[in-house]
């Protein structure tokens, strides 16, 4: 029978001589070289060969676990005269022994991760994984243990499961966004004379609402006209928030002030900026100055932040009033006066008022407009608005009488309105009756 | 040419009251806004307020909330200003000046009236 | 409230001298800016207005500069009647004053 143990071999033999195996043998072998011994299989005659009558085997190279851990192959043994088999031909294993050549390499070269900004100690960041092609079942070539050899103190990895964790509190997005961690992984546990590898992990800190919104200013200062129409923008307001995205988002509200139903404020969705926008009518002559108070908030708020204070700000907002000239305003829409038509000339029938509506209350002259008079019938006192008559009136020719005063600034021509004047003549009995009459 | 006079110097009590004038002349006085501003001894100058003659409308300083009131005459072209309960801390002298504009409640002062000594003293 | 910071507070300079002041205000007033001068005794007077603006009748030696939050007032050449103490004063929002720079005699 066959005489022989597993074989084993140790991988990239460096010696000079070729890489003694083992020996085969039969127990049907006496020394005296009778029998031949034949190798086949996995390599024989090439990687491996025999001699055949010792039964010797040696490795003619180097060899790599890694590429091949375990040959198969098989004996004969042949009795050299007869050519016959002493032994059945028999299987048996070259099993290739590892030694620690090769590091740890990591599945990705570079890994890119992301955390929020702020994150407790020991957060999650990404796991890296290292294999090592030696043999995880025989001494500790292929134990890897990580380590970070950059990125401290913001970042650790746990030795064992290549976790990366937070490491460091408060960490700012504000301050620093990107961090490149270097993790190694050394094989033999870690020890002396392990191998080791590396990987590059970009780690990029994201965004939380950790900053509340800031005027640059504390006061701004905008000016309108009063004839500004509900809806017009008077000026633009914009609080910075050092977050980004929606942690970024600011809503402006006008929350005090005299101007608060005067005046609104909308939020520019794509500048961010807070609109102040006219509400209501103004009137120079009734306020010149409004004092506001505009906040800018964030919507979207992390309750957890809420101990670094309010998420919002305020600004003063000083609305200053212009002044429009306005025209006189009279004191009706339209004026109705009665005169009897035997009224003699420079006859007062009446009187209209006007005022300039403007705070400086500027003096008003009136006249009548000659295109509703061309037969110049009546007249007015440009200083008190008094209407009279400068010519006679004859109801029978003209009943109604429609007119046109107009009110005119006197520093300012240009301003003016117009008022238009119903002057009804009244009858007398100045006529003779007309026809024949028969009596009975 | 634009004028600002205003009265002369006044001593006052502790406690009191103390009303100074500012007689305009040279332009339209309603179209103006006026405002005061004092000066302590060797010190800076201080905004009070304003007057806009053409309506009465006002508006105060702060500080001087509850204590100033700046009224006008049209009929005279005068402002006044009456600060009350006077410590010894106003003591100063109180200018009047003339807002450039007449359209709205902003700019520079382009002329101002010669200015009023009010000391206050027990 | 805005407030005006103007420096120095007081400079010793002689008859033809380049002097310059400076006005800071606490918040961006844009060209909110103006210069007067007072002398003892007297009423501050308008030199310049929306921080460059020359007021007429003033000499052309006086000239203002900046905006937004840093001004300065230069006078090129120092005359006799120079000397005085000179406010910068605010009106983008109310009406602030600068506590003044007193330009003496060397």
């Known amino acids: 029978s066959w005489m022989w143990n597993q074989f084993f071999l140790l991988e990239e033999y460096t010696g000079s001589d070729y890489q003694y195996v083992g020996k085969l043998h039969s127990d049907q072998d006496r020394g005296d070289g009778s029998l031949k011994y034949i190798l086949s299989g996995d390599g024989a005659g090439d990687l491996f060969i025999i001699n055949e009558n010792t039964g010797d085997i040696q490795a003619t190279k180097r060899l790599d676990r890694e590429e091949k851990p375990v040959y198969i192959l098989r004996a004969q043994a042949i009795n050299r005269r007869t050519g016959r088999p002493v032994e059945p031909e028999s299987e048996f294993i070259i099993k290739i022994h590892d030694i620690n050549d090769n590091e740890p390499i990591f599945t990705k070269e570079v890994y890119t991760a992301t955390v929020p900004e702020m994150s407790d100690v020991g957060t999650f960041v990404v796991q890296v994984t290292a294999t090592d092609a030696d043999d995880p079942t025989y001494g500790n070539s292929a134990k890897v243990v990580y380590s970070i050899l950059q990125g401290q103190p913001y970042f650790s990895v746990e030795s064992e499961t290549g976790i990366i964790k937070t490491a460091l509190l408060n960490m700012d997005r504000e301050n620093r966004e990107q961090y490149q961690v270097v993790i190694q992984a050394k094989d033999m546990g870690g020890q002396m004379g392990g191998l080791s590898g590396t990987t590059t992990v970009n780690i990029t800190l994201t965004d939380v609402n950790d900053n509340p919104p800031r005027f640059p200013q504390s006061t701004y200062q905008f000016k309108t006209p009063e004839s500004s129409p509900p809806g017009t923008p008077i000026g633009r307001i914009k609080a910075s928030d050092a977050d980004v995205g929606e942690n970024a988002e600011i809503e402006y509200s006008i929350t005090d002030g005299e101007g608060l139903d005067m005046f609104d404020v909308i939020t520019d969705q794509e500048t961010q900026e807070g609109i102040i926008t006219v509400k209501k009518l103004l009137d120079f002559e009734k306020k010149k100055v409004y004092t506001l108070k505009v906040e800018a908030s964030n919507p979207y708020v992390e309750p957890r932040f809420l101990y670094l204070g309010p998420f919002k700000d305020s600004a003063t907002v000083r609305i200053v009033v212009e002044d429009v000239d306005e025209p006189p305003v009279f004191s009706k829409l339209a004026y109705i006066l009665q005169i009897r038509e035997d009224a003699q000339i420079n006859t007062t029938i009446g009187s209209v008022t006007a005022q300039d509506p403007d705070a400086a209350r500027n003096p008003v002259k009136y006249s009548v407009d000659r295109h509703t008079d061309m037969d110049r019938i009546f007249n007015i006192d440009s200083g008190n608005g008094s209407i009279f008559t400068s010519k006679l009136l004859d109801r029978e020719t003209l009943l109604w009488h429609n007119i046109t005063v107009i009110a005119t600034e006197i520093n300012n021509p240009k301003q003016s309105s117009r008022v238009p004047l119903y002057i009804k003549v009244l009858d007398v009995n100045d006529n003779a009756p007309t026809g024949l009459s028969t009596g009975a | 040419e634009v004028q600002l006079v205003q009265s002369g110097a006044e001593v006052k009590k502790p406690g009191a009251s103390v009303k100074v004038s500012c007689k305009a002349s040279?332009?339209?006085?309603?179209?103006?806004?006026m405002h005061w501003v004092r000066q302590a001894p060797g010190q800076g100058l201080e905004w009070m307020g304003w007057?806009?003659?053409?309506?009465?409308?006002?508006e105060y300083a702060q500080k001087f909330q509850g204590r100033v009131t700046i009224t006008a005459d049209t009929s005279t072209s005068t402002a006044y200003m009456e600060l009350s309960s006077l410590r010894s801390e106003d003591t100063a002298v109180y200018y009047c000046?003339?807002?450039?504009?007449?359209?709205?409640?902003?700019?520079?002062?382009?002329?101002w009236g010669q200015g009023t000594l009010v000391t206050v003293s027990s | 409230d805005i407030q005006m910071t103007q420096s120095p507070s007081s400079l010793s300079a002689s008859v033809g001298d380049r002097v310059t002041i400076t006005c800071k205000a606490s918040?961006?007033?844009?060209?909110?800016l103006a210069w007067y001068q007072q002398k003892p005794g007297k009423a501050p007077k308008l030199l310049i207005y929306?921080?460059?603006t020359l007021q007429t009748g003033v000499p052309s030696r006086f000239s203002g500069s900046g905006s937004g939050s840093d001004f300065t007032l230069t006078i090129s050449s120092l005359q006799p009647e120079d000397f005085a103490t000179y406010f910068c004063?605010?009106?983008?929002?109310?009406?602030?004053f600068g506590q003044g720079t007193k330009v003496e005699i060397k």
């Open positions: 918040q961006n007033i844009y060209k909110n």
């Open positions: 040279g332009y339209t006085f309603t179209r103006n806004f």
């Open positions: 929306d921080a460059n």
């Open positions: 007057i806009y003659p053409g309506d009465g409308e006002t």
């Open positions: 004063q605010q009106y983008y929002s109310g009406w602030a």
């Open positions: 000046a003339r807002g450039v504009y007449g359209g709205f409640a902003g700019g520079y002062f382009d002329f």
